[in-house]
Every structure is written in structure tokens, then in C-alpha cells.
């Protein structure tokens, strides 16, 4: 639900800044938060036909 802060950025705002270590980018509000606050898609069972998705979380390496 990329609302609030994201909506205020405007369509032409720059790409999000990488997060500091131990934080992840919350796509839904467009800012960095503790990774544990976000819930990722359920993992695919072994042998699933579709490729594993890129994570929406973008922790700083």
C-alpha cells in the first residue's frame, strides 16, 4: 500500500535510497524499516515450476 510518504514523493521523484544495514525498503510506503517488520511472499515448495521471486525487501549489503 504505497501510501503516505510514497504518494508525497510524486511521480518523478528519484529512486529510493538504499537502506542501512539491517533495514529493508518497504515498497508500500517507500521508506526503510527494520526488515522484521515486513512479510515476504510465502516460499515456493521445492520443485515449484515458477522461478523464485526477487524479494521486495532491499537490505543494504
Amino acid at each position: 500500500m504505497r501510501r503516505g510518504p510514497r504518494s508525497l514523493r510524486g511521480r518523478d521523484a528519484p529512486a529510493p535510497t538504499p537502506c542501512v544495514p539491517a533495514e529493508c525498503f518497504d515498497l508500500l510506503v517507500a521508506h526503510c524499516v527494520a526488515c522484521g517488520l515486513l512479510r515476504t511472499p510465502r516460499p515456493k515448495p521445492a520443485g515449484a515450476s515458477s522461478p523464485a521471486p526477487r524479494t521486495a525487501l532491499q537490505p543494504q549489503e
Epitope: M1, R2, R3, G4, S7, A15, P16, D26, L27, L28, V29, V33, G36, L37, L38, R39, T40, P41, R42, S50, P53, T55, A56, L57
Partner: antibody, heavy 117, light 111 residues
């Protein structure tokens, strides 16, 4: 596995306030996003709003003057309050939670509300 | 608000054949290189069930008969082959812009 369960009245009179509860098990409402969605007769789905991990709320502008979403983290429940209901609010109300892309992968079974005098 | 227009409103497909449902958005739902478009199946008396997220990623536990494609404003859900259990209403949903919106639904029946 996350489980959600809606509870509340099945009949409300026009002009009254609707109050619904979503009870969550299998995860804490202090992480993620916690939504209310409704489905009208005729099959239209409407996103109503959410409360997230920080307690931040978002409301669909079509409802903004009438809606409130709150939570009680000690009970792991969140709530919908809709004021001044009319017959147009007759619908099935769902609570649901999305993952990081906003796709809602866990839903409650829904509770059917009729607004009638 | 982003308006999602689904077509057809209903379709009847023979068992074992392909069903194709289209969803067109009134503006792009892409951001950060991701298409924020998702597909759901809903049967009577049940909540919607997530099938596809991010336009083409198959949700865990969903049969590979379901697939999604598209980007920007034009998206497609394909069911191939169609089975009896697929009779339902299918919805697209965008989570790119506030407020999130759903398509009007496509009712799938068996011919």
C-alpha cells in the same frame, strides 16, 4: 500460517455505526499490513484501508470522512469502524493481510453485513 | 484512482482448453521495475484467493496451469488447461497507486 477471523453484527440500521473486529493468529499485527476490504452485491470489490506495523493508517478517500481503523496489539486484533452507514454499505466485509508487494495472500472468511431499517 | 477494466465480463471455456482474461489499467502500475498487479480467484461463499502476484509470479500452492503476464497497463491471466474446479470469478488488483483498486471481475464457466 496466518489466520484471520472477522466478527461483528450482521444487521445494522441506517445512520448507525458499524464496528467489526479482525482477530489474527499465526503472526503479530506489529509486523506487516492489516487491511479491510468489502465486496458488494454484484461482485464489486473495494479496498477500504489498512493499519500497518507502526500503527499508521491509510483510508480510501471514498470513505475517509466515515472510516477508522484501530488495533489492540495485546489482543492481536484490529478493528473497523464505519460511521453513518446507509444501505449502500451492505456488503461482505473481509480482513486480509498482504505481503511486500501488496498482494493479499491471507484472508478471513468474511462477514456479511446488511444495512436495513 | 487507477481504473482496472477486465475483459471479457464472462466467458465459457471447454474443459481442457485455454482461458484468457485481460486486465487493462488506466495508467501504468509499474514502479521500481516491478508490476504491482495481482490476480485472485473467488468462489461463492469463499474469500478471494491469491493466484498470481507481481504480474507473473505464481503464488505458493497454486497449480502451474495458472500463469500471468504483462507490464505497464496491459495484463493477462491464462488458465491452461481449464478444469472444472476453475469455475469462479477472477479479479485483477493493482497496488501501485493509492487507493488500491480491483477490476470488475470475470466470471469463468465451463462450456
Amino acid at each position: 500460517e496466518v489466520q484471520l477471523q472477522e466478527s461483528g453484527p450482521s444487521l445494522v440500521k441506517p445512520s448507525q455505526t458499524l464496528s467489526l473486529t479482525c482477530s489474527v493468529t499465526g503472526d503479530s499485527i506489529t509486523r506487516g499490513y492489516w487491511n479491510w476490504i468489502r465486496k458488494f452485491p454484484g461482485n464489486k470489490l473495494e479496498f477500504m484501508g489498512y493499519i500497518n506495523y507502526s500503527g499508521t493508517t491509510y483510508y480510501n478517500p471514498s470513505l475517509k470522512s466515515r472510516i477508522s481503523i484501530t488495533r489492540d496489539t495485546s489482543k492481536n486484533q484490529y478493528y473497523l469502524q464505519l460511521n453513518s452507514v446507509t444501505t449502500e454499505d451492505t456488503a461482505t466485509y473481509y480482513c486480509a493481510t498482504p505481503h511486500t508487494y501488496g498482494a493479499m495472500d491471507y484472508w478471513g472468511q468474511g462477514t456479511t453485513l446488511t444495512v436495513s431499517a | 484512482d487507477i481504473v482496472l477494466t477486465q475483459s471479457p465480463v464472462s466467458l465459457a471455456v471447454s474443459l481442457g482448453q485455454r482461458a484468457t482474461i485481460s486486465c487493462r489499467a488506466s495508467e501504468s502500475v509499474d514502479d521500481y521495475g516491478i508490476s504491482f498487479m495481482h490476480w485472485y480467484q473467488q468462489k461463492p461463499g469463499q474469500p478471494p484467493k491469491l493466484l498470481i502476484y507481481r504480474a507473473s509470479d505464481l503464488e505458493s500452492g497454486i497449480p502451474a496451469r495458472f500463469s500471468g503476464s504483462g507490464s505497464g497497463t496491459d495484463f493477462t491471466l491464462t488458465i491452461n488447461p481449464v478444469e472444472t474446479d476453475d469455475v469462479a470469478i477472477y479479479y485483477c488488483q493493482q497496488t501501485s497507486k493509492d487507493p488500491w483498486t480491483f477490476g470488475g471481475g470475470t466470471k469463468l464457466e465451463i462450456k
